[in-house]
Interface confidence: medium
C-alpha cells in the first residue's frame, strides 16, 4: 500500500508514534518519505547482504528475519514479510523498539540526512488528527 | 516438510514464451524469498533473480532483466517465472529454490527445450 | 559481479582417497561462501553453509573451510555415493553467483 501524507500521519498517531521517545509525528512521516516514498512493499537491498523492509525500511541484520541475512539477530522478534504489510502495526512496534536502542531516529540514514534539523511540521500540516 | 513442486518439461518454438511454477509446501509461503536458477550443460548454474511472495517484491540478475518475469499467488503457494522471446539459448534447466542465502531446498527443475 | 573460480575442473580419486576443493573469489565475500553437490539429473544438496557449518544429514567426512576468497571443501575418504560435480555459491552480494564446478569422478 501506498500511503497518502496525512493518511500516514493519522495512522502513525494511532499507533502512538507522535512524541514517542521526544520525536514529533513529523519526523516519523518525514522518514518514511525518505525511507519508502510511504510505500509499505518498499524493499531495499544493502552491500552487506541485508535487506530493508517496509515504510521505514527496517534492517534485516539487526532487527526481522528474512532467513538469509548472515547473523541476523531479528531483535524485533518478526520476519521481515511482516513489515510489508499495508497495516503498519508490525513496522511501527518494531521502529519503537529502534528508536528506543540508544540512537533515537539517527538509527534512519534518510531522517538523518533529509529530515533533522529540518521543518519537519511541514509533513503533518493540514492534516486532520 | 517443505517442498518445491515445479511443473513439467516444456517443449517450446522460437519466439514462444513459457510460464514455469513452482508450488511450495511446508512452510509459510510469504515470509521466504523464492530464487530462481539456470542451469546449462558446460554453464554451470547462473541466478536469474528472486522474488518475496508476500509483497511481490523482485530482483533480477541484469543479465536476464526482459527475459524472466517473476509473478506469485499466495492464494495456492505458487511462485511462477516467465521466460519471453525464447532463444536455443533458453534451452535449460530451470530451478526455485527457497531464499534462505543458502539453498537448502530446491525444486525438482523443470527441463526447457526450445526448438 | 562476485566471480567464483573452482579448481580442479576435473578431479579423479580411488574411492578411500581424500580430497580438498578449492574456490576461489574475485573479493572477499567474508564467510558468505556454501558447496552443493550434484549428480546427473538430480537438484544440487546443500552441503556446507557459510563455510564451515555442516547441513544436517551430511556425512562428518565432509568439512569447509576459508575465509575472505580462498575457501575449500575437503572430503575425508571419498566414497562412491560422493561422485558427481560440486558447486561454490555466494551470498555476499547481489546476484548471487556459482562457481563453475568441480567434477569428482572414478579414477
Known amino acids: 500500500k501506498v500511503f497518502g501524507r496525512c493518511e500516514l500521519a493519522a495512522a502513525m498517531k494511532r499507533h502512538g508514534l507522535d512524541n514517542y521517545r521526544g520525536y514529533s509525528l513529523g519526523n516519523w512521516v518525514c522518514a518514511a518519505k525518505f525511507e519508502s516514498n510511504f510505500n509499505t512493499q518498499a524493499t531495499n537491498r544493502n552491500t552487506d547482504g541485508s535487506t530493508d523492509y517496509g515504510i521505514l525500511q527496517i534492517n534485516s541484520r539487526w532487527w526481522c528475519n528474512d532467513g538469509r541475512t548472515p547473523g541476523s539477530r531479528n531483535l524485533c522478534n518478526i520476519p521481515c514479510s511482516a513489515l510489508l504489510s499495508s497495516d503498519i502495526t508490525a513496522s511501527v512496534n518494531c521502529a519503537k523498539k529502534i528508536v528506543s536502542d540508544g540512537n533515537g531516529m539517527n538509527a534512519w540514514v534518510a531522517w538523518r540526512n533529509r529530515c533533522k534539523g529540518t521543518d519537519v511540521q511541514a509533513w503533518i500540516r493540514g492534516c486532520r488528527l | 516438510q517443505v517442498q518445491l513442486q515445479e511443473s513439467g518439461a516444456e517443449v517450446m518454438k522460437p519466439g514462444a514464451s513459457v510460464k514455469i511454477s513452482c508450488k511450495a509446501t511446508?512452510?509459510?509461503?510469504?515470509?521466504?524469498?523464492i530464487e530462481w536458477v539456470k542451469q546449462r550443460p558446460g554453464h554451470g548454474l547462473e541466478w536469474i533473480g528472486e522474488i518475496l511472495p508476500g509483497s511481490g517484491s523482485t530482483y533480477y540478475n541484469e543479465k536476464f532483466k526482459g527475459k524472466a518475469t517473476f509473478t506469485a499467488d499466495t492464494s495456492s503457494n505458487t511462485a511462477y517465472m516467465q521466460l519471453s522471446s525464447l532463444t536455443s539459448e533458453d534451452s535449460a534447466v530451470y530451478y526455485c529454490a527457497r531464499g534462505d542465502g543458502n539453498y537448502y531446498y530446491w525444486g525438482q527443475g523443470t527441463t526447457l527445450t526450445v526448438s | 559481479d562476485i566471480e567464483l573460480t573452482q579448481s580442479p575442473a576435473t578431479l579423479s580419486v580411488t574411492p578411500g582417497d581424500s580430497v580438498s576443493l578449492s574456490c576461489r573469489a574475485s573479493?572477499?565475500?567474508?564467510?558468505?561462501l556454501h558447496w552443493y553437490q550434484q549428480k546427473p539429473h538430480e537438484s544440487p544438496r546443500l552441503l556446507i553453509k557459510y563455510t564451515s557449518q555442516s547441513d544436517s544429514g551430511i556425512p562428518s567426512r565432509f568439512s569447509g573451510s576459508g575465509s575472505g576468497t580462498d575457501f575449500t571443501l575437503s572430503i575425508n575418504s571419498v566414497e562412491t555415493e560422493d561422485f558427481g560435480m560440486y558447486f561454490c555459491q555466494q551470498s555476499n552480494s547481489w546476484p548471487r553467483t556459482f562457481g563453475g564446478g568441480t567434477k569428482l569422478e572414478i579414477k
Open positions: 573479493q572477499s565475500i567474508s564467510n558468505n
Open positions: 511446508g512452510y509459510t509461503f510469504t515470509t521466504y524469498w
